[in-house]
């Protein structure tokens, strides 16, 4: 996160760290807890690393430097990448992770509510992006979970900023015209959440941007509302019954 500040314990209890253990262990992506056994993240996090057993998912964590060999983590039972995601395109950048064992909810580890299907009418004015990613383009992973308040921008505005790309309906953009605040490398897959009527909702999944926090280059996020049917279908067919946090 560029231009952010330290988060507090329990402030973003749905935020998880997706880490890979090969020879060493490192944080690669963020994710959002959306049910006892489900994490929502970006499909591109698994490019070149589709093997379930190399991944460790840490929840209820604020400071990555607190993680030791004794820190509990979740393992992956199943990775469900959106069927239309292609490495060559970058559209449909969304994936579900089914955990091997369900998590108990605590003050520091609980799910984020999902938006209503096809939610286009809600005007979100209080949106935040969180993650342990770089604090500048040529930076490094941060220890303490960072947060930054970023306004949504229209897809039309976003398309002007990215003339050589296609900003699809299933994407949502956020950023300041002057730059300075944004997600960055290592924040991929993490949440863009907005508070509306006193409730936090998962509006976007951190996907891509041209550099980080550059002027007139907003961050691009997968628009979760456009994938509600897919999320429900995959979690229900795998679970028998869904355990999602949908809005009341």
């Amino acid at each position: 996160i560029v231009g952010g500040t330290n988060s507090s314990w329990g402030e973003w209890p749905w935020q998880v760290s997706l880490q890979v253990k090969l020879t060493a262990q490192r944080h690669l992506c963020g994710g959002s807890l959306i049910g006892h056994q489900w994490v929502l993240t970006a499909a591109h996090c698994f490019d070149g690393l589709p093997l379930q057993d190399v991944w460790r998912i840490y929840s209820g964590i604020l400071n990555l430097s607190d993680i030791t060999k004794d820190t509990p983590f979740s393992q992956i039972k199943e990775i469900i990448i959106h069927q239309n995601y292609k490495v060559s395109e970058g559209n449909h950048d969304i994936a579900l992770i089914k955990l091997q064992a369900p998590l108990n909810y605590t003050e520091f580890q609980k799910p984020i509510c999902l938006p209503s299907k096809g939610d286009t009418s809600t005007i979100y004015t209080n949106c935040w992006v969180t993650g342990w990613g770089f604090s500048k383009e040529k930076g490094e992973i941060q220890n303490i979970l960072q947060k930054v308040n970023i306004p949504l921008v229209t897809n039309e505005e976003c398309q002007k900023a990215y003339a050589d790309a296609k900003i699809a309906q299933a994407m949502v953009c956020a950023g300041y015209k002057e730059g300075g605040k944004d997600a960055c490398k290592g924040d991929s897959g993490g949440p863009l959440v907005c508070k509306h009527n006193g409730m936090w909702r998962l509006v976007g999944i951190t996907s891509w941007g041209e550099g980080c926090a550059r002027r007139e280059q907003p961050g691009v996020y997968t628009k979760v509302a456009e994938y509600m049917d897919w999320i429900l279908e995959k979690t229900q067919s795998s679970d028998g019954k869904a355990q999602m946090q949908s809005p009341a």
């Epitope: 591109h44 292609k86 490495v87 060559s88 395109e89 970058g90 924040d187 996907s207 980080c212």
Partner: antibody, heavy 125, light 108 residues
Amino acid sequence: EVQLLESGGGLVQPGGSLRLSCAASGFTFSHYLMTWVRQAPGKGLEWVSYISPSGGHTIYADSVKGRFTISRDNSKNTLYLQMNSLRAEDTAVYYCARVARGIAARSRTSYFDYWGQGTLVTVSS
Amino acid sequence: EIVLTQSPGTLSLSPGERATLSCRTSQFVNSNYLAWYQQKPGQAPRLLIYGASSRATGIPDRFSGSGSGTDFTLTISRLEPEDFAVYYCQQSSRTPWTFGQGTKVEIK
């Protein structure tokens, strides 16, 4: 199977014009940025131009700017290169290529993942 | 314009040997925008490596890419007879997109 098939090359006099076409199949053409790359006989590869998926955004190499125009017809899955005021130094094999733009570490990736077989353009009097 | 300089110009090696090809860029290039291509006589180029280190579909694991910033490397761990060709690095970080001048890997 992704296929790109160029056509329209041939012999043309200096100052003349030619229009190259590239017929695409096996993928959703309208989702991809497309590019032209050329290779003079016995020389290396030179990027010429690219066009955005919608066709609304184009960029050219300085060597062809103002003389060449890239365009596309997404309804026909076809990419074009209109070449005017041709010079001897434009003699080359012209390749069309698909530009893959995925995502890695929250940044786009960009690379030419499929190429046509090329069409030879010879500019000579 | 970002200039890509490949070295050596020609590499004379025997099958089974290791080939190390260098590509230096005149300005910083985000590694996501650095690719390597192989070209054989009379054929179109073929994508080998994208994002500086990711192998393209169907490319054997004897090909590997590495590097960041301004210094990138293509390594062929054990040359097979079909690997003798010209190799190009290419950047699409900034327009104009540019290629290196190529390294020819020939049989010694």
